[in-house]
Interface confidence: low
C-alpha cells in the first residue's frame, strides 16, 4: 500500500494523525471494530497535547478510547505502552467497579464530561474517536 | 423481585400518538440499561429502542426513527416510549426489558392496536 | 446490522429426547478482546414474555435447568435441550447484542411429538 499523504473526508487532521468523531454511541468492541473497518483504531492519547485537542472535539460527553483491560492488564489498542505512557484518570480511577448492577466490572475506558478518564462496562453505548497516522502505509484493496 | 410493568397500550387510529409507560420494581432502576421490544400478533420479536442508564444515550431501530421516543425518569423508576404517526404495522405487544447481556427480565407486555 | 437466521423454523422431540435448534449470524458476534460470544437464546410460552435462558452464548441464566446448554462460537451457535420435557414446549429465539440495533432470529417452535 502506498503511504497516506493527506485525511480522508470528514476526518480531522492533527500533528501527523486524522481523527474521526462519531456522532453516535456504540459499544466499545463495536466501535473498536468501526475503526479497524476504517483501517485506524479507536484513539490512543499519548500527549497532553492530544488530549487537549481531543477533548476540545468531543466536548463533554462520554466517548470511547483505544484503552481496556479485558486481558488483565491496561493495554493501548495500538501496542503503545502503557504504564510509561500518558494518563489522565479521573481522581480513584479506575475502580474496575462491580456496584453497577450489570455484572462483571469496568475493563474500557472512556473520557468523561471533563476530559478526565474513567473505566466503564464496555457494552455502553458511547461516541467514539476513530485515529489513524498519515505517516503509516494505507491499505490497497488487492485486486480480484 | 424485579418487576417491569407496562401501560399505556390501547387503539389508536393511524397517524395517531401513544405514550407507554414502564413501572420498574425490585432492582436499582438508575443502575441498568432498559430498551423496548415489540411482538405483532403471531410474529416474533423486534427491538426498538434503547436508553443509558443515565437517559443521555439512545439508540433507535430504523423502523422507529424519528417517529419513536425513549425515555426515562429515575426518580420514577420509570421507562417511556413516546410513539408518533402510528402505522398499522406498529401493532404489536410492546415490551420493556432491563438490558444487559440480553434483556435479562421483560414486563408482561402492552397491546398497541393500530387501525381505522 | 446483524440478521439472525435460526433452523428449524419447527420440531417435534419426543419427551426425554434430545432438541437441537441452530442459529446462525450474518457476521461475527465474537469480540477477540475477551473472547466473548455476544448471543443470547430466549424461551417463549404462550401468552408470555421471552425468557432469557442463556448469555455469552454458553452460560445458563440462574435458574435455568441444566438440561438447557448453548454452544457455539463466531456466526454459528446451537441451543440444546438434552431431555425434552413437557413443560419445554416454546418458542425459541436467539438474539445479538453484539451490535446496535440488537437482533433476534426469527424464532423455532419446539413440539412434543
Known amino acids: 500500500g502506498s503511504e497516506r499523504t493527506c485525511c480522508p473526508v470528514n476526518w480531522v487532521e492533527h500533528e501527523r494523525s486524522c481523527y474521526w468523531f462519531s456522532r453516535s454511541g456504540k459499544a466499545w468492541a463495536d466501535a473498536d471494530n468501526y475503526c479497524r473497518l476504517e483501517d485506524a483504531h479507536l484513539v490512543v492519547v499519548t500527549s497532553w497535547e492530544e488530549q487537549k485537542f481531543v477533548q476540545h472535539h468531543i466536548g463533554p460527553v462520554n466517548t470511547w478510547m483505544g484503552l481496556h483491560d479485558q486481558n488483565g492488564p491496561w493495554k493501548w489498542v495500538d501496542g503503545t505502552d502503557y504504564e510509561t505512557g500518558f494518563k489522565n484518570w479521573r481522581p480513584e480511577q479506575p475502580d474496575d467497579w462491580y456496584g453497577h448492577g450489570l455484572g462483571g466490572g469496568e475493563d474500557c475506558a472512556h473520557f468523561t464530561d471533563d476530559g478526565r478518564w474513567n473505566d466503564d462496562v464496555c457494552q455502553r453505548p458511547y461516541r467514539w474517536v476513530c485515529e489513524t497516522e498519515l505517516d503509516k502505509a494505507s491499505q490497497e484493496p488487492p485486486l480480484l | 423481585q424485579v418487576q417491569l410493568v407496562e401501560s399505556g397500550g390501547g387503539l389508536v387510529k393511524p397517524g395517531g400518538s401513544l405514550r407507554l409507560s414502564c413501572a420498574a420494581s425490585?432492582?436499582?432502576?438508575?443502575?441498568?440499561?432498559m430498551s423496548w421490544i415489540r411482538q405483532a400478533p403471531g410474529k416474533g420479536l423486534e427491538w426498538l429502542s434503547y436508553i443509558s442508564s443515565s437517559g443521555t444515550t439512545v439508540f433507535y431501530a430504523d423502523s422507529v426513527k424519528g417517529r419513536f421516543t425513549i425515555s426515562r425518569d429515575n426518580a420514577k423508576n420509570s421507562l417511556y416510549l413516546q410513539m408518533n404517526s402510528l402505522r398499522a404495522e406498529d401493532t404489536a405487544v410492546y415490551y420493556c426489558?432491563?438490558?444487559?447481556?440480553?434483556?435479562?427480565?421483560w414486563g408482561q407486555g402492552t397491546l398497541v392496536t393500530v387501525s381505522s | 446490522d446483524i440478521v439472525m437466521t435460526q433452523s428449524p423454523d419447527s420440531l417435534a422431540v419426543s419427551l426425554g429426547e434430545r432438541a437441537t435448534i441452530n442459529c446462525k449470524s450474518s457476521q461475527s458476534v465474537l469480540f477477540n478482546s475477551n473472547n466473548k460470544n455476544y448471543l443470547a437464546w430466549y424461551q417463549q410460552k404462550p401468552g408470555q414474555p421471552p425468557n432469557l435462558l442463556i448469555y455469552?452464548?454458553?452460560t445458563r441464566e440462574s435458574g435455568v435447568p441444566d438440561r438447557f446448554s448453548g454452544s457455539g462460537s463466531g456466526t454459528d451457535f446451537t441451543l440444546t435441550i438434552s431431555s425434552m420435557q413437557a413443560e419445554d414446549v416454546a418458542v425459541y429465539y436467539c438474539q445479538q447484542y453484539c451490535s446496535l440495533p440488537f437482533t433476534f432470529g426469527p424464532g423455532t417452535k419446539v413440539d412434543i411429538r
Open positions: 425490585g432492582f436499582t432502576f438508575s443502575d441498568y440499561y
Open positions: 455469552w452464548a454458553s
Open positions: 426489558a432491563r438490558e444487559w447481556v440480553g434483556a435479562d427480565y
